[in-house]
């Protein structure tokens, strides 16, 4: 699996989308998990409703929510009040029995808020986005970055 990068700003919400084949994964619950090390387990953060037909209902675990459009084939995860420690490697999963298929590997990048003058000026620098051989960068609004495009405008 390639890794998709989603960028969000500390204190704001980040929405992660994971597209999938709705027919192939028909009837399957979904989950969002955090990788705990390169060879470690993927620790479940939140999963969709126990009743697959109710997967469209948003379920929360702390500041993380999950909802599944089973017809359209899009799993959506919302990380509310994004914090530095939310940065990390995650997976969208499709569950069947005790097994889990990876729908998408997601790398979450948390940027400091450039408008937070208390300390963001001391922490944030807008780096240029590049195209990577195995990484795809998306904004929290789920728009793909073009090659060479800057994720946020430089501040003077």
């Amino acid at each position: 699996h390639n890794t998709t990068v989603f960028q969000g700003v500390a204190g704001q919400s980040l929405q992660v989308s994971c597209p999938y084949d709705s027919m192939k994964h028909w009837g399957r619950r979904k989950a969002w998990c955090r990788q705990l090390g390169e060879k470690g387990p993927c620790q479940r953060v939140v999963s969709t409703h126990n009743l697959w037909l109710l997967s469209f209902l948003r379920r929360w675990n702390g500041s993380t929510a999950i909802t599944d459009d089973t017809l359209g084939g899009t799993l959506t995860i919302t990380l509310r009040n994004l914090q530095p420690h939310d940065a990390g490697l995650y997976q969208c999963q499709s569950l069947h029995g005790s097994e889990a298929d990876t729908l998408r590997k997601v790398l979450v990048e948390v940027l400091a808020d450039p408008l937070d003058h208390r300390d963001a000026g001391d922490l944030w620098f807008p780096g240029e986005s590049e195209s990577f051989e195995d990484a795809h960068v998306e904004h929290s609004i789920s728009r793909s970055l073009l090659e060479g495009e800057i994720p946020f405008p430089p501040t003077s």
Epitope: T3, V5, Q7, Q35, L36, G37, E38, G40, Q83, P84, H85, A87, G88, L89, K105, L107, E109, L111, A112, D119, L123, W124, F125, P126, G127, E128, S129, E130, F132, E133, D134, A135, V137, L145, P151
Partner: antibody, heavy 115, light 107 residues
Amino acid sequence: QVQLQESGPGLVKPSETLSLTCTVSGGSISSYYWSWIRQPAGKGLEWIGLIYTSGSTIYNPSVKRRVTMSVDTSKNQFSLKLTSVTAADTAVYYCARDLFYFDYWGQGTLVTVSS
Amino acid sequence: EIVLTQSPATLSLSPGERATLSCRASQSVSSYLAWYQQRPGQAPRLLISDASNRATGIPARFSGSESGTDFTLTISSLEPEDFAVYYCQQRSNWPWTFGQGTKVEIK
């Protein structure tokens, strides 16, 4: 097995710019975070900053106005530049992978600031 | 920034003894705390992540625990190679910070 190797001048004059490069082998630099950490002789560890896959950076306020980090994915390298150095910047500088805490480190390179 | 205070500064023990190292955070870091070992002339090595998860290849004699803002690294029975400096580190909030270190020396 991922390996990191720091390289750069071991001696820098005061007020000049310290430049170091970290070369990553045994794996792709993409889809991870990378940090620089330093350690003055006989003292503790200080985190300088990190660079994300996208090239965005987070810097420690203690050095923010003097530091720039960049990444070159084609060479599997990331770099550190620290301007206007003083004797207080003399330390062993480490590069490290930062995704699952600092799970891979370079062996460190000693940078001395002296005229 | 979050300040991590390690105690004691030095711990003098004999091989086979139990070592208990403490790290206290100035504010909550949840479980986002790691422990590293640094031997003389070497780079630090990750021992424990997320307060209690042993890193790959780390012997079972190393364990981590937490209670609020207090974190503990325990080495159940010291081996000769365990005599080194140990650092805690938080990644709950920027900037990432380290404790000042605890030196475990041979008594």
